[in-house]
Interface confidence: medium
């Protein structure tokens, strides 16, 4: 029950996280700036990964997409790539994790297969979250670096004259959305990996054996429960009786009216 809850919660947290990563990638408010630091001519500029918008104090807003790739900074291209990779990995992870959910039964899929799928999706979520966090952090670093570069240029540019109009860089809402979303995806991925440990069938577990009356005599073979120790040749819990003895897993492998898909 705890495993199912952990897996389900990990899935939901990752789902919210990936939705947030997609939202952050599409948002225009990655950086916000006052272009002309003047109360009368307040021109508010907010920029995203794909386009830039300018809103004036009068309310007039104009947006323009970045149509050229050549003129864009390499850092911006890197951020775009990281966010897209994060979304793609997250989307694949979600798809895999849906089939890995313990509450969903697909045919006669074994727990070991579900455990592997849960681990795969968990790793994908972790990498996806890291990509988003890295992308947002690179962009934030770019803003901070350029802020200090601009401040330095105030005293060195234009023949030593002080640049009185200084662009002020601030972190846009998308950065915070990206950080939170990346963190949630990361947490969701960790939860999926934890759930995987609970799903994986351990070799040292006792297997319940059901005995069925058989027409011929059943010869007892010594070392029949070697699987319980994890040592010896019978670590795969194979049948060790010639007769109608079957492990409980084998008995349950046939679909019944109580199986829900």
């Amino acid at each position: 029950m705890a495993v199912t809850a952990c897996q389900g919660l990990g899935f939901v947290v990752s789902l919210i996280g990936i939705a947030g990563i997609i939202a952050a990638t599409c948002m225009d408010q990655w950086s916000t700036q006052d272009l002309y630091n003047n109360p009368v001519t307040a021109v508010f500029n907010y920029q995203g990964l794909w386009r830039s918008c300018v809103r004036e104090s009068s309310g007039f807003t104009e947006c323009r997409g970045y149509f050229t790739l050549l003129g864009l900074p390499a850092m911006l291209q890197a951020v775009r790539a990281l966010m897209i990779v994060g979304i793609v990995l997250g989307a694949i992870g979600l798809l895999v994790s849906i089939f890995a959910l313990k509450c969903i039964r697909i045919g006669s899929m074994e727990d070991s297969a579900k455990a592997n799928m849960t681990l795969t999706s968990g790793i994908m979520f972790i990498v996806s979250g890291l990509c988003a966090i890295a992308g947002v952090s690179v962009f934030a670093n770019m803003l901070v670096t350029n802020f200090w570069m601009s401040t330095a240029n105030m005293y060195t540019g234009m023949g030593g004259m002080v640049q009185t109009v200084q662009t002020r860089y601030t972190f846009g809402a998308a950065l915070f959305v990206g950080w939170v979303a990346g963190g949630l995806t990361l947490i969701g991925g960790v939860m999926m990996c934890i759930a995987c440990r609970g799903l994986a069938p351990e070799e040292t577990n006792y297997k319940a054996v059901s005995y069925h009356a058989s027409g011929h005599s059943v010869a007892y073979k010594p070392g029949g429960f070697k699987a319980s120790t994890g040592f010896g040749s019978n670590t795969k819990n194979k049948k060790i009786y010639d007769g109608g003895a079957r492990t409980e897993d084998e008995v349950q492998s046939y679909p019944s009216k109580h199986d829900y898909v």
Partner: nanobody, 119 residues
């Protein structure tokens, strides 16, 4: 990087006219906002006029309203400032300013062109 080159400055009599031009060159020319600033000796730099990309939004400082006209030609990557009815108070070094729309881009400035108005 964007380079801005101003031209058109010079000596003019009060009441006369001058036309300043600013040409943008470089890989990223799609600047949203371009403007003209001026700085007289011993004074702070002030914004004279600015224009947005499409030319649909223009701002003028109160001191130049009705006398100066800002325009831009995106095809030629140029911006102009037509200055009419010049006054001695308009004498200053005029700087072209451009702001690229790409995130993290710098403010670009020209070297300036001197405008002198004689009484």
């Amino acid at each position: 990087e964007v380079q801005l080159v101003e031209s058109g400055g010079g000596l003019v009599q009060a009441g006369g006219s001058l036309r300043l031009s600013c040409e943008a060159s470089g890989p990223a020319r799609n600047n949203y906002y371009m403007g003209w600033f001026r700085q007289a000796p011993g004074k702070e730099r002030e914004l004279v006029a600015r224009i947005n990309l499409s030319g649909s939004s223009i701002y003028y400082a109160d001191s130049v309203k009705g006398r100066f006209t800002i325009s831009r030609d995106n095809a030629k990557n140029t911006m102009s400032l037509q200055m009419n009815s010049l006054k001695p108070g308009d004498a200053a070094r005029y700087y072209c300013h451009a702001r690229d729309i790409v995130p993290g881009a710098q403010d670009y400035w020209g070297q300036g062109t001197q405008v002198t108005v004689s009484a």
